[in-house]
């Protein structure tokens, strides 16, 4: 039967009674080896003869003394079998054995749960020699026990390669319940059931669980650990914890907040990072995510011109990186811009609207109906055109750039003229006779030079020829311009 000692029991003696050879308990040991910082097996004395190997926990010596008396079997004496104590208390237990003096090289080691204890354990071995035998007491002490000290402790002694093993001493460290699983914070959908788990262990067992929601007990009666609470749904944030009870008392888990997922708050601080003629780069600060990650965002763009039809352009983008380049905008236009973001629950309201403007751009179309004719009397080339549609000027017209290329007998030279925005005609001097003049015109704004018109060619004859009909750009869709003579 296992002997059980509770922590409140009186200290038990180091060994049950006098050792063989009438060794008294008040004898001082001949040799005492404390091992405070690492256990080393004790050395025994030189024997006169070796013992015969024997398997098992008891070694039966076959050697006889001078008087030819048979030696008793070697075994550790019985000691307390089960020690129960509270965390942080001190404990001391021991193994004792009487070994005939004929044996040498005897070692004692402590083992816990099948592993030898070699570290910083407080083990002391004391020797009480007598005429024929030496009593050995191996003590093991722990000053402040922890749960990790729970286990089965044994002593082992080696005599001439023979191993003697003591009965186990079970150390049971009891304390308040210890959580192995606590509820975790969660973000949940409104009115949707979810689970929380709580698990705690002793010893002592059993451990019982009470769930607490917003300071009220959920279960009126304890539930065995582990316990899973199915919360039937929440309409507002709640705080949960669990209480673990055992015979030593109560441990309360951390309180965890369960949040209800909601639509996000609208983004804030929408700002213009950069504007061009046809695009605006915006950034924003996301609002509160409603306890659910943002999925994407929507940029809404309205023309701020009171005469516009009020239609809204919508651009969808990923939630990160809180930046978006709005493209395909008109130059020199005013826009209202708002941002909305969504999570799994739905869309936020739109951010406060901000006003933004595109800059002037280079015109997007060339001047129309370009006509070129030779005025031989003044030795000039007259050029006429129609200015591009206002919407496609992409800014305020500041003038035109005329490119005229003169080609004659393998020689080619290009000249550029700038003209003011007021007229829609220009006159350029003939540079070379008996040559072809190719004319192209582009509109110019502060935003840059627009595309050049399709080339219009006119042949400039040698002096003395008659005037020629004008050349002009064809109607849209026609082939290349043709010189009309």
């Amino acid at each position: 039967a296992i002997t059980e000692a509770r922590e409140e029991a009186k200290p038990y003696p180091l060994f049950p009674g006098p050792f063989p050879g009438s060794l008294q308990t008040d004898h001082t040991p001949l040799l005492s080896l404390p091992h405070a910082s690492g256990y080393q097996p004790a050395l025994m004395f030189s024997p006169t003869q070796p013992g015969r190997p024997h398997t098992g926990n008891v070694a039966i010596p076959q050697v006889t003394s001078v008087e030819s008396k048979p030696l008793p079997p070697l075994a550790f004496k019985h000691t307390v079998g089960h020690i129960i104590l509270s965390e942080h208390k001190g404990v001391k237990f021991n193994c004792s054995i009487s070994v005939p003096n004929i044996y040498q090289d005897t070692t004692i080691s402590w083992w816990k749960d099948g592993k030898e204890l070699l570290g910083a354990h407080h083990a002391i071995t004391q020797f009480y020699p007598d005429d024929e035998v030496t009593a050995i007491i191996a003590s093991f002490s722990i000053t402040s026990v922890q749960r990790s000290d729970n286990g089965s402790y044994i002593c082992k002694m080696k005599i001439n390669n023979e191993e003697i093993v003591s009965d186990p001493i079970y150390i049971e460290v009891q304390g308040l319940p210890h959580f192995t699983k606590q509820p975790e914070s969660m973000n949940v959908t409104r009115n949707t059931a979810f689970n929380l788990t709580c698990q705690a262990v002793g010893p002592p067992e059993p451990v019982n669980i009470f769930w607490v929601q917003n300071s009220s007990r959920v279960n009126e009666q304890p539930e065995k650990s582990p316990s899973v609470l199915t919360v039937p749904g929440l309409t507002e944030m709640a705080v949960f914890s669990c209480e673990a009870h055992n015979d030593k008392g109560l441990t309360v888990s951390k309180g965890v907040q369960i949040n209800i997922k909601a639509i996000p708050s609208p983004p804030t601080e929408v700002s213009i990072r950069n504007s061009t003629a046809h695009s605006i780069l915006i950034s924003w600060v996301p609002g509160f995510d409603g306890y659910s990650p943002f999925r994407n965002c929507s940029i809404q763009v309205k023309e701020a011109d009171p005469l516009s039809n009020g239609s809204v352009m919508i651009f969808n983008t990923s939630a990160l990186p809180h930046l978006y380049q709005i493209k395909q905008l008109q130059a020199l236009a005013n826009y209202s811009i708002g941002v909305s973001c969504m999570n799994e629950i739905g869309w936020s309201a739109v951010s406060p609207w901000i006003l933004a403007s595109t800059t002037e751009g280079a015109p997007s179309v060339a001047p129309l109906n370009v006509t070129v004719f030779l005025n031989e009397s003044s030795d000039n080339v007259d050029i006429r055109w129609m200015k591009p549609p206002t919407k496609q000027q992409d800014g305020e017209l500041v003038g035109y750039r005329i490119s005229h290329v003169w080609q004659s007998a393998g020689i080619s030279k290009e000249l550029l003229e700038e003209v003011g925005q007021n007229g829609s005609r220009a006159r350029i001097s003939v540079q070379v006779h008996n040559a072809t003049c190719t004319v192209r015109i582009a509109a110019v704004t502060r935003g840059g030079v627009g595309p050049f018109s399709d080339p219009v060619k006119i042949f400039i004859p040698a002096h003395g020829w008659v005037d020629y009909a004008p050349s002009s750009t064809p109607a849209p869709g026609n082939a290349d311009p043709v010189l009309i003579i």
Epitope: N191, W211, Q213, N214, S216, V218, N219, E220, Q221, P222, E223, L229, P232, G233, T235, A238
Partner: antibody, heavy 118, light 106 residues
């Protein structure tokens, strides 16, 4: 299946005592509390309190202290309601109910009519 | 203690009509349970924790609400639904019941 079976109707004189039983079956008795609910003739439900079947500790609602006693015999999975010094106003149907999480009474006894009349 | 006030006290409706029963709490409560009682019978669990149907309860019954205001709805009354309905709160002791709403045939 879970069942709560209550003892039969009682006719008592004022000043007498009565003990109503509620026998549980189909579940582990000590895992759930037992609530007691009173319903006077033509009236609504009135919560009287409950008894913890794990510890035996009773909890009484206001107005049900003193003459009312909740008790248990866990060996036969039975809860009891004893009323002493009976008065005419104690005439009612008394129900026992199993207490689940969130104080939800998920199974009810059939009720016991206690009539107090001289 | 939390006082539960049910309204109306009596609701006169015809089969097939929609019934809406209200239960108001004197202070905020996390969940409301609902029970149905017919004459001479024990109360029968109907809705657990505001909106969860008890075992065997048909889907025409539904519950909603939060804080101090809770509702039991019967989408289309069947003849067997004419009974008294009680709400009961969970949050604080004592575990009070409402005074009941009687749903009767018009």
């Amino acid at each position: 299946q879970v069942q709560l079976v209550q003892s039969g109707s009682e006719l008592k004189k004022p000043g007498a005592s009565v003990k109503v039983s509620c026998k549980a079956s189909g579940y582990t008795f000590t895992n759930y509390g037992v609530h007691w609910v009173r319903q006077a003739p033509g009236q609504g439900l009135e919560w009287m309190g409950w008894i913890n079947t794990y510890t035996g500790e009773p909890t009484y609602a206001q107005g049900f202290t003193g003459r009312f006693v909740f008790s248990l015999d866990t060996s036969v999975s039975t809860a009891y309601l004893q009323i002493s010094s009976l008065k005419a106003e104690d005439t009612a149907v008394y129900y026992c109910a199993r207490g689940y999480r969130y104080a939800y009474m998920d199974y009810w006894g059939q009720g016991t009519l206690v009539t107090v009349s001289s | 203690e939390i006082v539960l006030t049910q309204s109306p006290a009596t609701l006169s409706l015809s089969p097939g009509e929609r019934a809406t029963l209200s239960c108001r709490a004197s202070s905020s409560t996390s969940y409301m349970h609902w029970y149905q009682q017919k004459p001479g019978q024990a109360p029968r669990p109907l809705i657990y924790a505001t909106s969860n149907l008890a075992s065997g309860i048909p889907a025409r019954f539904s519950g909603s609400g939060s804080g101090t205001s809770y509702t039991l709805t019967i989408s289309s009354l069947e003849p067997e639904d004419f009974a008294v309905y009680y709400c009961q709160q969970w949050s604080s002791n004592p575990r009070t019941f409402g005074g009941g709403t009687k749903v009767e045939i018009k």
